[in-house]
């Protein structure tokens, strides 16, 4: 005989996580980012939607604009001008591409109360921004840029050539939006607003993706997109200042290319001003292991741009492409010149270097086996900035802060010791002069937002610790979280295990791989997360494991330039390589094992299905690239080289998903793409598909119409809810 | 140029209301936005109220709807009626000028000063 078990009422009432908590959003949390306007001045938009003024030293706040104000116009966002004048407000939001969107701006004079009424800007607008002091206004309509001196002046027209799908003034086409810059605007104001340098992208020879969007008419809508796939011709790039101050006098001037990237296709990285009459460029060569930045000075007497060659600063992997995913970003420091900037050491670390005249004499600021990841703030005496270096963890990120005052220079890690089981991986945002900082954690434990003195680093006060949340999750049994490596042939794999709540490791489970597996990406980072894999582990049983292989970020050279001009090869391996060491582990069921990825996860775990292992069961490709000659050139390019027969186009061939189409005989697939994806063309999927049926190979479909690679809305529910009966059926679990 | 001078603090009971005024000497008063700033002992001097030269006014949080600041431009001055007075309204009530917007909330924004008057009110 057993003794009956104790009867714990606390434990009686947890419950597992359901399905329907996730599509509702249940269990998400809140983050604090100040919209910082002075050194210890920020705002914030109140739950009830009033515009709020916060001033950190007296305590004190001031609401600015009403709710009421919001409303009258279904304003969702606002912006304050540098000279607290005016404020514009943005309603009628219609999303276009990841960060593109169009909206109708009003402008309100805070001095009457009143709307700025007469010369009131057209709609709908592309973009629109202040300029760094006063109340100049620029923004981008029908591909134009216009200046206004002041909201209700007249628009002064800087650009005529602006046509849709043609000619990008201010503005990203898709590619650089998506890809280089990565924002929805493409202007740049000097910091005190005397200039403003804009980028001009000619996409007339771009060939384009038309789609069909099928709406509710009659006849479907065709999306036409200049889109250049991987190979084809390339958006044309330059880069204009104009004076705003006379924009008549001499127009539109334009920056010179340095030669040695003129010489043949390149790209435009990224623009930072230095001072009023000093601005840094970055340029790229098409095939992106070399990029120049150069620092252009303005030349009063002929009113030029100067960029002299003993100003240019070249960068260049020979291992690899430059850069991480994307080529860094040099913060200068106050001398206007030197500059502090990301980029490999000779151990193959990513590191933060100090550049006073030469690349090859910069001083190296950040050192060791792990990785520099951002540079946050420099001021007079201190450097900011995020790595993954506290106790070998690659998947956390702690801000450090580095007196650059002193020499030797001092580091202190601001955040490590903070709240150390709840906050692991941080960013942080600061004011004006680093006076005052917030401090964002997201987890491993429920994020909690706080506001520090940029001084002593003392916490002020906590702006959100999501309070409800944490009470919401008292009575819910999440599943358990594991980080871990494994030390495979002189590769480190990080994997994250997410168990269910009562995981015994005498029992066996169900095994679900969620890949992605992109070059430069992370899937094991100390974060909070309640999705629908935490769904799974809680109420379905299973174990989830996410696994960094060959080509991901954070963990040195070797690791992320592997996959270097061979994607499709070792991102798969180390999938599979990782299930093999979970299945010795014990606990794991190996009739029941599945993966699913979305995007390059989709290609990943299509590739992982079929490689011939035998290993998987069944498994989900969302939204999946099939062959790399479908996608954006300025992506593949930077991993694969170009699709010619005297560059990489072999393996071109030999990575696509359609060439194993024989190899899915023996799992069950699920695909699924949406119809209106501008990103993976559902291209992707449809040869997959043809491959397949080719093949008479059988599997499943789902399709999602008028939908993009996000599959946002109430397909959400329906993509969750479908991919939980396919794993469900496959692992022979009740419904 | 604009010169500023204070009156009508004292000393007043809980619950209990005042009147401070700030006259200004110069012909552009219209043009200046108006503040009144209070610095308690041993506390940073904090925006209590402050009305912008289009009449648009501006409130801290804790005196929304006790306080009201008003301007006469033709008198060249700037009032702030206070009700339902607290002790922990208890300060010296500085009266400051700028051109410009007023809804700037540090005292080093504000370039012309009154030199104060004490208000004290109590329990």
């Known amino acids: 005989l057993r003794p009956s078990r104790v009867h714990n009422s606390e434990e009686n009432t947890m419950r597992a996580l359901t399905l329907k908590d996730i599509l509702n959003g249940t269990f998400s949390y809140k983050t604090f980012f100040p919209n910082w306007i002075s050194g210890q001045e920020y705002l914030h938009q109140s739950a009830d939607n009033n515009i709020v003024l916060y001033n950190i030293e007296t305590g004190q706040s001031y609401t600015i604009l009403s709710n009421r104000t919001m409303k009258s116009v279904n304003a969702s966002n606002y912006g304050l001008s540098p000279d607290r004048q005016f404020v514009y407000l943005e309603s009628d939001y219609s999303k276009l591409w990841r960060y593109s969107y169009t909206a109708t701006y009003y402008i309100y004079d805070l001095s009457n109360g009143e709307f700025v009424r007469g010369n009131e800007l057209p709609r709908p607008i592309q973009y629109l921004c202040w300029s760094p002091v006063g109340s100049k206004l620029a923004y981008v309509y029908q591909n134009n840029i216009y200046l206004k001196q002041r909201p209700g002046d007249p628009p002064f027209q800087i650009t005529f050539n602006g046509r849709e799908n043609k000619i990008f003034n201010g503005i990203p086409d898709w590619v650089y939006e998506e890809e280089m810059l990565p924002t929805k605007y493409a202007l740049w104001w000097s910091p005190n607003g005397k200039f403003l340098a804009y980028a001009e992208f000619n996409d007339k020879d771009i060939p384009v993706i038309a789609y069909s969007y099928y709406g509710d008419e009659q006849y479907p809508r065709t999306i036409n997109i200049p889109y250049p796939k991987a190979g084809a011709k390339n958006p044309v790039v330059r880069i204009f200042i104009i004076d705003t101050t006379y924009p008549a006098y001499v127009g539109p001037q334009e920056v010179p290319v340095p030669a040695m990237i003129a010489s043949s296709d390149y790209y435009f990285s990224w623009l930072t001003w230095v001072t009023d009459e000093r601005v840094c460029l970055q340029w790229l060569k098409r095939v992106q292991n070399v990029s120049v930045l150069s620092i252009c000075d303005f030349r009063e007497d002929w009113q030029t741009w100067d960029c002299p060659k003993t100003q240019e600063h070249i960068e260049e992997s020979r291992t690899g492409w430059a850069g991480g995913f994307f080529v860094s970003r040099p913060v200068f420091s106050y001398d206007a010149i030197s500059y502090y900037k990301i980029f490999s050491d000779k151990d193959g670390y990513k590191h933060i270097h100090y550049i006073k005249d030469t690349v090859e004499n910069a001083i190296q600021i950040t050192s060791g086996k792990w990785e520099a990841i951002n540079i946050f703030r420099v001021t007079q005496d201190s450097l900011f900035y995020s790595s993954n270096e506290f106790e070998e963890y690659p998947g956390r990120r702690n801000i450090y802060r580095i007196s650059i005052g002193s020499y030797p220079p001092s580091k202190k890690c601001v955040t490590c010791h903070l709240r150390k089981e709840r906050c692991q991986y941080y960013t942080a945002s600061f004011s004006d002069y680093a006076k005052y900082y917030a401090l964002v954690c997201y987890g491993p434990g429920i994020p909690i937002s706080t506001l520090h003195d940029g001084r002593t680093d003392q916490e002020i006060k906590i702006l959100e610790e999501n309070k409800e949340l944490e009470n919401a999750l008292k009575n819910i049994q999440l599943p358990k979280e594991e980080i871990k490596k494994l030390e495979v042939d002189e590769i480190t794999l990080w994997y994250k295990m997410i168990l269910p709540p009562q995981f015994d490791r005498s029992k066996k489970y169900p095994l679900l791989i969620q890949v992605y597996g992109g070059p430069c990406s992370q899937s094991v980072r100390s974060v909070f997360a309640v999705n629908w894999i935490s769904y799974l582990a809680s109420k379905e049983g299973m174990v989830i494991a996410l696994v960094d292989g060959r080509g991901t970020a954070f963990q040195g050279d070797k690791l992320l330039y592997a996959v270097y001009r061979k994607l499709g090869v070792y991102e798969v391996e180390d999938q599979i390589t990782a299930v093999r060491k979970f299945i010795e582990m014990g606990f794991i069921d190996e009739k029941r094992i599945a993966i699913w990825g979305w995007s390059y996860g989709g290609y990943v775990s299509s590739l992982a299905l079929a490689s011939g292992t035998g290993l998987f069961k069944c498994g989900i490709a969302v939204a999946p690239v099939s062959s790399w000659e479908y996608y954006a050139s300025v992506y593949t390019e930077r991993f694969m080289g170009l699709p010619t027969k005297d560059d990489n186009l072999e393996h071109y061939k030999n990575s696509t998903v359609m060439a194993r189409a024989e190899y899915f005989r023996n799992v069950d697939y699920l695909l699924i793409h949406g119809t209106a994806d501008d990103n993976v063309h559902f291209q992707n999927s449809a040869q997959i598909a043809k491959a397949l049926v080719n093949a008479q190979v059988d599997f499943q479909a789902m399709w999602y119409s008028d939908q993009n690679h996000g599959l946002s809305g109430l397909s959400t529910n329906h993509l969750y809810t479908h991919m939980t009966h396919f794993l469900k059926q496959c692992f022979s679990l009740s419904d | 140029q604009v010169q500023l001078q204070e009156s009508g603090g004292g000393l007043v009971e809980a619950e209990g209301s005042l009147r401070l005024s700030c006259a200004a000497s110069?012909?552009?008063?219209?043009?200046?936005?108006m503040g009144w700033f209070r610095q308690a002992a041993g506390k940073e001097r904090e925006l209590v109220a402050a009305?912008?030269?289009?009449?648009?006014?501006l409130y801290a949080d804790n005196v929304k709807g006790r306080f009201t600041i008003s301007r006469d431009n033709a008198r060249n001055t700037v009032y702030l009626l206070s009700n339902s007075l607290k002790p922990e309204d208890t300060a010296v009530y500085y009266c400051?000028?700028?051109?410009?917007?007023?809804?700037?909330?540090?005292?080093?924004?504000?370039?012309?000063w009154g030199q104060g008057t004490q208000v004290t009110v109590s329990s």
């Open positions: 009305i912008s030269a289009g009449g648009s006014t």
């Open positions: 110069g012909r552009t008063f219209g043009s200046y936005a």
């Open positions: 400051a000028a700028r051109r410009g917007s007023a809804y700037y909330t540090n005292h080093i924004d504000w370039p012309y």
